[in-house]
């Protein structure tokens, strides 16, 4: 089973069914359909999946049977286009069905919605969930796949199978426990948080491929895998990068069966050749397939070889740099990136890519100059400010985080980003700033050598969320510019933005600052989101408000909520005290 297997199969659908097995086949088709038709009811998707599965079985029995030679896109697209309510539910997406493959699939991909208008998932009582799990385990787990896939249309499908396996294990264990809730709820919280993080990481991979092309993704992969596998040869890293690129291209393109199959092959290859790749893979390679693939993807960096020579001799001091570069530009730059990355597990991937880009730009300029060697001799000096910028930023922000704690650090970022891009919707600013703020608890605890790769690569994932949400309804030229100009310079671009002086403050609307007793029954997290939403709105009304003014208003607001939630007549308290608070805030901010 090599990379070009499909040529040998008369029926692609039969081939994938046999490779993956019925259970994974059905799960992946369900994920694919739910990621395309995000508004369709669960029962409709199950029906479509069952029809596809029955058809696949006929092809397994006889690969020459009618329609079995059709591509998966043709088969799945034809099936999706049988949905009766396509025009009413999806509007112009129905026009995709008039197209032929491959344009039809491209059309479906373009209509994936990163922020679908779907109700928030509310977690039922534990007993209710356990009853549903025991009554029909298969339906219960399919529902999980469906609900996650439709809300996260770029979720990495083979990884979602791993999440579903853990979800099932949690219910199997906890629904028999003495204290079901104490057992189950922390596991579900962990799966939810990990799932959101996994979705966001994959969304960046797909954006990288779709917006910046295969070369950009491959460069990212060379840098990351060279850090992770510093003992591996460049050709080994290159082979892994090629295969990984194929896997992610397939998943991001909606080819989930091929993606899952190729990911399994890649895990198999890595484990068969771990001696040439990394000493850290042993435990991963003893696990079953889904756990194995997940484990490999998260494996810690191997130790750096002890005797790595200086790079300056061959990449700067040598007179042959331009000759070598001219002979095979991408191989030479790939080697430079590999050599630099394996020596620097302490750098973020995006920093390594900035250094490689600087090196490439210098060679392009200098190799055409009269004295190339003289021209590129100082190229490594140009790296210093590029390295120091994220180092200083992380130092400052970790100090601020340690001083303020997560909630107040998020608030500082909310104010900072609302002033930078006040046109962005309040829910997006709250979501993105809250996630940016989580960098503190996630990364500042690490020693210096691990802070930058943790922080800056995490920030790249979060800022990509801003970029994909903003792309759906663009409102800020500054956001568009930072998102589209350079993938690796997104974070520095946003960091460099100052207060938007062109912004006309939002009209004051008392309704925005009217609160009710329902806030008292919210979880701490939901209450924080309410307060942070108010903070963004305040800044939109008064972008020139000082930190002190905003802090005073927010402190008053927190006291107001605490007071009214303790009152006997909460609703009356919120109505009366709320009016006073609005008036006092207006006065304090000069509104």
């Amino acid at each position: 089973r090599g990379v070009f297997r499909r040529d040998a199969h008369k029926s692609e659908v039969a081939h994938r069914f046999k490779d993956l097995g019925e259970e994974n086949f059905k799960a992946l088709v369900l994920i694919a359909f739910a990621q395309y038709l995000q508004q369709c009811p669960f029962e409709d998707h199950v029906k479509l999946v069952n029809e596809v599965t029955e058809f696949a079985k006929t092809c397994v029995a006889d690969e020459s049977a009618e329609n079995c030679d059709k591509s998966l896109h043709t088969l799945f697209g034809d099936k999706l286009c049988t949905v009766a309510t396509l025009r009413e539910t999806y509007g112009e997406m129905a026009d995709c069905c008039a197209k032929q493959e491959p344009e039809r699939n491209e059309c479906f991909l373009q209509h994936k919605d990163d922020n679908p208008n779907l109700p928030r998932l509310v977690r039922p009582e534990v007993d209710v969930m356990c009853t549903a799990f025991h009554d029909n385990e298969e339906t219960f787990l399919k529902k999980y796949l469906y609900e996650i896939a439709r809300r996260h249309p770029y979720f990495y499908a083979p990884e979602l199978l791993f999440f579903a396996k853990r979800y099932k294990a949690a219910f199997t264990e906890c629904c028999q426990a003495a204290d079901k809730a104490a057992c189950l709820l922390p596991k579900l919280d962990e799966l939810r948080d990990e799932g959101k993080a996994s979705s966001a990481k994959q969304r960046l991979k797909c954006a990288s491929l779709q917006k910046f092309g295969e070369r950009a993704f491959k460069a990212w992969a060379v840098a990351r895998l060279s850090q992770r596998f510093p003992k591996a040869e460049f050709a080994e890293v290159s082979k892994l990068v090629t295969d990984l690129t194929k896997v992610h291209t397939e998943c991001c393109h909606g080819d989930l069966l091929e993606c899952a199959d190729d990911r399994a092959d890649l895990a198999k290859y890595i484990c068969e050749n771990q001696d040439s790749i990394s000493s850290k893979l042993k435990e991963c390679c003893e696990k079953p397939l889904l756990e194995k693939s997940h484990c490999i993807a998260e494996v810690e960096n191997d130790e750096m070889p002890a005797d790595l020579p200086s790079l300056a001799a061959d990449f700067v001091e040598s007179k042959d740099v331009c000759k070598n570069y001219a002979e095979a530009k991408d191989v030479f730059l790939g080697m430079f990136l590999y050599e630099y990355a394996r020596r620097h597990p302490d750098y973020s991937v995006v920093l390594l890519l900035r250094l490689a880009k600087t090196y490439e730009t210098t060679l392009e300029k200098c190799c055409a100059a009269a004295d190339p060697h003289e021209c590129y001799a100082k190229v490594f000096d140009e790296f210093k400010p590029l390295v120091e910028e994220p180092q200083n930023l992380i130092k400052q922000n970790c100090e601020l985080f340690e001083q303020l704690g997560e909630y107040k650090f998020q608030n500082a970022l909310l104010v900072r980003y609302t002033k930078k891009v006040p046109q962005v919707s309040t829910p997006t600013l709250v979501e993105v700033s809250r996630n940016l703020g989580k960098v503190g608890s996630k990364c500042c605890k690490h020693p210096e050598a691990k802070r930058m790769p943790c922080a800056e690569d995490y920030l790249s994932v979060v800022l990509n969320q801003l970029c994909v949400l903003h792309e759906k309804t663009p409102v800020s030229d500054r956001v568009t510019k930072c998102c589209t100009e350079s993938l690796v310079n997104r974070r520095p671009c946003f960091s460099a933005l100052e207060v938007d002086e062109t912004y006309v403050p939002k009209e004051f609307n008392a309704e925005t600052f009217t609160f009710h007793a329902d806030i008292c029954t919210l979880s701490e997290k939901e209450r924080q989101i309410k307060k942070q939403t108010a903070l963004v709105e305040l800044v939109k009304h008064k972008p020139k408000a000082t930190k002190e003014q905003l802090k005073a208003v927010m402190d008053d607001f927190a006291a107001f909520v605490e007071k009214c939630c303790k009152a006997d007549d909460k609703e009356t308290c919120f109505a009366e005290e709320g009016k006073k608070l609005v008036a006092a805030s207006q006065a304090a901010l000069g509104l």
Epitope: E233, F234, A235, E236, S238, N273, S276, P305, D307, L308, P309, L311, A313, D314, F315, S318, D320, K323, N324, E327, A328, V331, F332, G334, M335, E339
Partner: nanobody
């Protein structure tokens, strides 16, 4: 066209040392991955050590780590293999090979494009 010429082989007692050399002519960046392979009678050819002549990174098969050292002198277009603490099982014909750094893998001789004629190393107990 790349030409590789090995020298320095010979016979030595167990525990002794030898240094073999490989001079490359017509070498380019796309043949800047240089390796040493060996083949004992009746056995498959196996990778011993490799070096990127641009970058200088080195790789070794497990059985020679700590005993053998590969190095280069780019000015002389020469790659060396210093072999210390030689054992009888190191007896083999030693071949120099060159290939593209994007393709060459020490565990796979087919990923190297150019080969020398070989030099015999014999270690007696």
């Amino acid at each position: 066209h790349v030409q590789l010429v090995e020298s320095g082989g010979g016979s030595v007692q167990a525990g002794g040392s030898l240094r073999v050399s490989c001079v490359a002519s017509g070498n380019t960046y796309l043949t800047s991955c240089m390796g040493w392979f060996r083949q004992a009678p009746g056995k498959e050819r196996e990778g011993v050590a490799s070096i990127y002549t641009v970058g200088g990174s080195t790789f070794y098969t497990n059985s020679v780590k700590g005993r053998f050292t590969i190095s280069r002198d780019n000015a002389k277009n020469t790659v060396y293999l210093q072999m210390n603490s030689l054992q009888p099982e190191d007896t083999a014909m030693y071949y120099c090979a060159a290939g593209s750094p994007a393709r060459c893998r020490l565990r796979d001789p087919t990923t190297f494009d150019y080969w020398g004629q070989g030099t015999q190393v014999t270690v007696s107990s």
